[in-house]
């Protein structure tokens, strides 16, 4: 980028630049129209019989420098070829010198600083590349002269550029003084400010552009050279905040629109709201749970919301005495997640209709919550008594939900108890042909035994035809026809109101071999 | 020598037109740029019309602007001023005047008038 | 556009300096002219570019310009310098050439 500091063909009114000696034969401001039919200013010399040592000086006005520290200056020129003026003495040159002189202020004179090398810094001879033919009677021929010339390095506040003709025939055509930056550039969403080189290269430190947020890494910089060009180099840049994403050509940063998010800072667009979130608002950096669905704190910003599962179905209880097995189906609603569990609540009802929920005894085996397979078993329940289980499906989400917790009940009453084996017993009398037993009276917990029932067969004869049946009621009993010198496996149960209870073990009695033995008494 | 004359004025009558002349010699005509400059009786200079040296760009003051055109013959080293819709305030003594001339590009000029003719009267009246 | 104002008349004896002012709105950033005219006869450029001289013209004649004012100068007057003075310059547009009110110098 090119910051002009002076532009004569831009200029409306005369130049008025400084000329010395004030003699004949010096530099003179013509004025004409450009392409445009804007006037222009040039300035012209031909002194081509100058006596020896004579130049002729031409200075601009003082140029304020801007804080450029180089400053280039394009010089447009047409120069008479001596030859084909008449006039021209061994004197005639077709080159001209051009000098700097650096001031902090527009002191200069029309005899100050002198006018000589220095103070006046050369800054080089032009010679003609071109050189115009001027025959007499006829126009002028020849092609204009471009030169660029850089001056410096400047420090002070300004400077006058300063043209020494010795004997030319030419014309300024134009001036144009400038000085080279490297105009503002944003890449990769870092903005460089226009920067004006102070030496071959400078860094220049970037700053991120609005809603971006530095790339992780050393601070973005850029190297601004004297050319005014920005060096290629990689950019660790910034990148687009969360809620905007790169725009433009990676320039600057836009807010994502409603409807989309973005939850991170760094590459990457804006995505639409997953399931049952929604942003309202431009900009978001996470979509809002639509009412009734949430995010678990281990969600990702940018994973769907969910919601509680329904109900677990079809729950099924297996009761076998004292222990209960329970199975269900998943639910309906699995909230849109993976991570379902079951639970279990209980409560108990005593005979006497009193409930309470589930006391210590009961043991659940995997375990009351945290189920991840549809089942459970229930151990240690008391007989008589009616369960309410209440199965529900839980999720990652379901502490955040308000309001009950859906959940599929089941109801289970145990049997009562029944009187327990009948175990000690003992034969009171044998004979060839029959055996007297008696046994302990057991402790029934619902109520009194009403009778027993004695189940007795001969051992080895083991098929169901071979087993007799004796009700008593009384804890004794006579078992008669038997075969002599027999070996008999006897049981006992005993039954309450709640039922019979489980036959007792075996017992190994055996009948007399003979009949004059009588009858004796065994005890157990 | 170097000089120009001017010709062409006289008596003219409201509305109507003149055509003034300007003969250059002694310098390199096409290399001038050239202008037309009037004085009214008792008034003071009042510049009227000019012309590049080529003859391309032409430029009048607003008071003559429409009414009156320069021109230029090259080839015989002449100036002109049509004068039309003449009105009674256009009378003036009506000078020739060459502008300061380049070293060797017609393209451009000096600002002042550094050669005048020596005038030639028009007269608008009924 | 620039309008230069002169004074109508100026007055000096013999062998003094008369001095003829032209002023104008910021005129020291334009070059001035300046113009004889004797009675009867065409202008004569006396000075041009502010104080240059053309060959031919006295060396009492010189001219200034500076901030808003223009002036011509000529140092020990002479008789045969009674004449009309005319400044001129350019306006804004390049080939509008714009002059003076005029100046009668009389000398006593």
């Known amino acids: 980028l090119e910051e002009t500091l002076l532009n004569t063909k831009l200029e409306t009114a005369d130049l008025k630049w400084v000329t010395f000696p004030q003699v004949d034969g010096q530099w003179e401001e013509l004025s004409g129209l450009d392409e445009e039919q804007h006037s222009v200013r040039t300035y012209e010399v031909c002194d081509v019989q100058r006596a020896p040592g004579q130049a002729h000086w031409l200075r601009t006005g003082w140029v304020p420098r801007r804080g450029a520290v180089h400053v280039y200056a394009t010089l447009r020129f047409t120069m008479l070829e001596c030859l084909s003026l008449p006039r021209a003495g061994r004197s005639c040159k077709e080159t001209f010198t051009v000098f700097y002189y650096e001031s902090d202020a527009d002191t200069a004179t029309a005899l100050t600083p002198a006018w000589m090398e220095n103070p006046y810094i050369k800054v080089d001879t032009v010679a003609a590349e071109h050189l115009t033919r001027k025959r007499p009677g006829a126009e002028a021929t020849g092609k204009v002269n471009v030169k660029t010339l850089r001056l410096g390095p400047l420090s002070k506040a300004g400077f006058y550029l300063a043209f020494q003709d010795q004997g030319a025939c030419m014309a300024l055509l134009s001036l144009h003084l400038f000085y080279k930056k490297c105009a503002q550039l944003t890449v990769n969403l870092t903005r460089f400010p226009e920067t004006v080189p102070r030496e071959l290269v400078v860094p220049v430190a970037g700053s991120c552009v609005v809603d971006a947020v530095p790339a992780p890494g050393p601070s973005p910089s850029l190297y601004c050279r004297e050319d005014g060009q920005w060096a290629e180099q990689p950019v660790t840049g910034c990148s687009c905040a969360p809620g905007f994403e790169a725009a433009e050509g990676n320039t600057k940063c836009r807010a994502c629109a409603q409807g989309t998010f973005k939850p991170l800072s760094g590459e990457g667009s804006c995505q639409p709201c997953p399931a049952n979130s929604h942003s309202n608002t431009i900009g978001s950096a996470v979509c809002q749970c639509r009412v009734g669905y949430f995010r678990a704190r281990t969600d990702p910003r940018g994973a769907p919301c969910t919601t509680p599962p329904s109900a677990p179905r079809s729950v099924v209880s297996r009761l076998n005495g004292s222990s209960l097995h329970l199975e269900w189906s998943a639910p309906l609603e699995s909230g849109g997640r993976e991570d379902l569990t079951y639970a279990l609540r209980c409560r108990e009802c005593r005979p006497g209709g009193s409930c309470a929920p589930c006391g210590g005894d009961l043991t659940f085996d995997p375990g009351p919550r945290d189920l991840v397979e549809p089942w459970v078993v229930v151990r240690g329940l008391r007989p008589d008594f009616t369960y309410t289980f209440e199965v529900t499906a839980l999720n990652g989400v379901s502490s955040l939900a308000t309001g009950p917790v859906p959940f599929e009940p089941v109801n289970v009453t145990t049997d009562r108890e029944v009187p327990p084996a009948v175990s000690d017993i003992r034969v009171t009398r044998s004979s060839p042909s029959s055996l007297s037993l008696a046994w302990a009276v057991p402790r029934a917990p619902s109520g009194a035994v009403l009778d027993y029932e004695v189940k007795y067969h001969e051992k080895g004869a083991e098929g169901p035809s071979s087993v007799r049946f004796l009700k008593t009621s009384e804890n004794r009993a006579e078992l008669r026809g038997l075969k002599r010198g027999a070996s008999y496996l006897v049981q006992v149960r005993a039954r309450s109101e709640a039922g019979y209870g489980p036959f007792g073990q075996e017992h190994h009695s055996q009948t007399q071999l003979d009949e004059s033995e009588g009858w004796r008494e065994q005890l157990a | 020598q170097v000089q120009l004359v001017e010709s062409g004025g006289g008596l003219v009558q409201p509305g109507g037109s003149l055509r003034l002349s300007c003969a250059a010699s002694?310098?390199?005509?096409?290399?001038?740029?050239m202008s037309w400059v009037r004085q009214a009786p008792g008034k003071g200079l009042e510049w009227v019309s000019g012309?590049?040296?080529?003859?391309?760009?032409?430029f009048y003051a607003d008071s003559v602007k429409g009414r009156f055109t320069i021109s230029r013959d090259n080839s015989k080293n002449t100036l002109y001023l049509q004068m039309n819709s003449l009105r009674a305030e256009d009378t003036a003594v009506y000078y020739c005047?060459?502008?300061?001339?380049?070293?060797?590009?017609?393209?451009?000029?000096?600002?002042?008038?550094?050669?005048w003719g020596q005038g030639t009267l028009v007269t608008v009246s009924s | 556009d620039i309008e230069l104002t002169q004074p109508p008349s100026v007055s000096v004896a013999p062998g003094q300096t008369a001095r003829i002012s032209c002023s104008g709105d910021?005129?020291?950033?334009?070059?001035v002219h300046w113009y004889q005219q004797k009675p009867g006869q065409a202008p004569v450029l006396v000075i041009y570019?502010?104080?240059k001289r053309p060959s031919g013209i006295p060396e009492r004649f010189s001219g200034s310009n500076s901030g808003n004012t223009a002036t011509l100068t000529i140092s020990g007057t002479q008789a045969e310098d009674e004449a009309d003075y005319y400044c001129?310059?350019?306006?804004?547009?390049?080939?509008?050439?714009?002059f003076g009110g005029g100046t009668k110098l009389t000398v006593l």
């Open positions: 570019y502010d104080s």
């Open positions: 002694g310098f390199t005509f096409n290399n001038a740029w």
């Open positions: 005047a060459r502008k300061g001339m380049s070293f060797y590009n017609n393209k451009y000029a000096k600002s002042m008038f550094d050669l």
């Open positions: 001129s310059a350019w306006t804004t547009t390049m080939m509008h050439i714009v």
């Open positions: 012309i590049s040296a080529d003859g391309v760009h032409k």
């Open positions: 910021n005129l020291g950033k334009k070059y």
